[in-house]
Interface confidence: medium
């Protein structure tokens, strides 16, 4: 797994697609729909908790129309998730083993209809703007989760949320190194797929402890980090620009070289 050294970890190749505008839908072009599992276990969110989880990560719970648009752009995910209308759905582009759940062999967004709010599932979130910049932070010894929090704060920033990383990815952030995020997860954004970076599709990769795509990394393990600085913040001394951003919309990538 990129940037992880000898540690055993498992990545999910989340194909995360940018959603173009759907006529009549209240969102801007370039938004991103993504599957979100904030904790270490699968299917753990009530409807209320699902809404809050998306908000906490800098996003909102996705609408059925947004998930449908993502599906039509190629998004698939073998995980049932809450949507804004309290339905539970998941998108399947190419039905196949080992995703047990689709009733037939045709592709589509599967729906379980409106579910009782106390049932628990994952959630699909939507993010369409990044009011600031996400930057990649590293140092020789890397960071524990707590050290990553402190490091970002010492550079006039916060540890980025998952939603902020997805938004930055949609604007061109590409880094083949996994980094800590605010929810304790470990992820990395890939715009240009390459063999060493976890798959042949663009997307945000998530590093899990277990091969069934559950489990958060040990907070004491050492990794890089992704920080977020709001628009009004001023860069701190000791930061260097890590290269010209590939993004058309100017997401800056900063590599912190200060040890």
């Amino acid at each position: 797994t990129p940037g992880l050294g000898p540690a055993t970890a498992f990545t999910s190749e989340d194909l995360v697609v940018q959603v173009t505008a759907v006529p009549g839908q209240p969102h801007l072009p370039g938004g991103v729909v993504f599957h979100y599992r904030p904790g270490p276990t699968r299917y753990s969110l009530t409807f209320e908790e699902a809404q809050q989880a998306c908000l906490r990560t800098g996003a909102v719970i996705a609408s059925p129309e947004q998930l449908q648009a993502a599906y039509e752009a190629g998004y698939e995910q073998c995980d049932a998730g809450w949507l804004r209308d309290q339905t539970v759905r998941y998108p399947i582009v190419s039905p196949r083993t080992p995703c047990v759940g689709d009733k037939d062999s045709s592709p589509g967004v599967r729906t379980y209809g409106v579910r009782p709010s106390t049932e628990t599932y994952d959630v699909y979130c939507f993010v369409d703007r990044l009011e600031g910049e996400v930057f990649f932070a590293t140092r020789l010894e890397q960071f524990t989760f707590q050290e990553a929090l402190e490091f970002c704060e010492s550079h006039n920033a916060t540890l980025a949320t998952t939603g902020q990383l997805y938004a930055a990815w949609s604007r061109g952030l590409d880094k083949c190194y996994a980094g800590w995020l605010a929810d304790g997860s470990l992820r990395y954004p890939i715009v240009t797929p390459r063999p060493a970076c976890g798959g042949d599709k663009p997307g945000v990769r998530t590093v899990y402890l277990y091969p069934n795509q559950t489990g958060l990394p040990d907070p004491l393990s050492r990794h890089h980090a992704f920080c977020f600085r709001g628009i009004s913040a001023v860069p701190s001394p000791g930061e260097e620009e890590g290269g010209t951003p590939t993004s058309p919309s100017g997401v800056e990538e900063w590599i912190v070289t200060q040890v």
Partner: nanobody
Amino acid sequence: DVQLVESGGGLVQPGGSLRLSCAASGPTFSRYAMGWFRQAPGKEREFVAAITWSSGGRTYYADSVKGRFTISRDNSKNTVYLQMNSLRPEDTAVYYCAAARIPVRTYTSEWNYWGQGTLVTVSS
């Protein structure tokens, strides 16, 4: 919670057949897949077959049993079956029935409920 009870295991000669049954009790959940896994001595538990619980449920098989095993279910009886034909010595294992909320992958750890297992021995 869902309780699962398997039956139908036993000793059979190579090339023979067996039919396993799994009865589910407890609340009826419309969002559960049912599956069969097996564990041979000294080996990890592995996926065998699965079926969605909805009408017209879709079936899934491990490559090693495709064409020989058939999974089916009778919703009116809350029962799932595994018809095993052309049995081989390497099919010897404890067979477990499992239930999971769907969609689910074929990883053992994604299945929520398990039966106690029934032993199938294929030997001459």
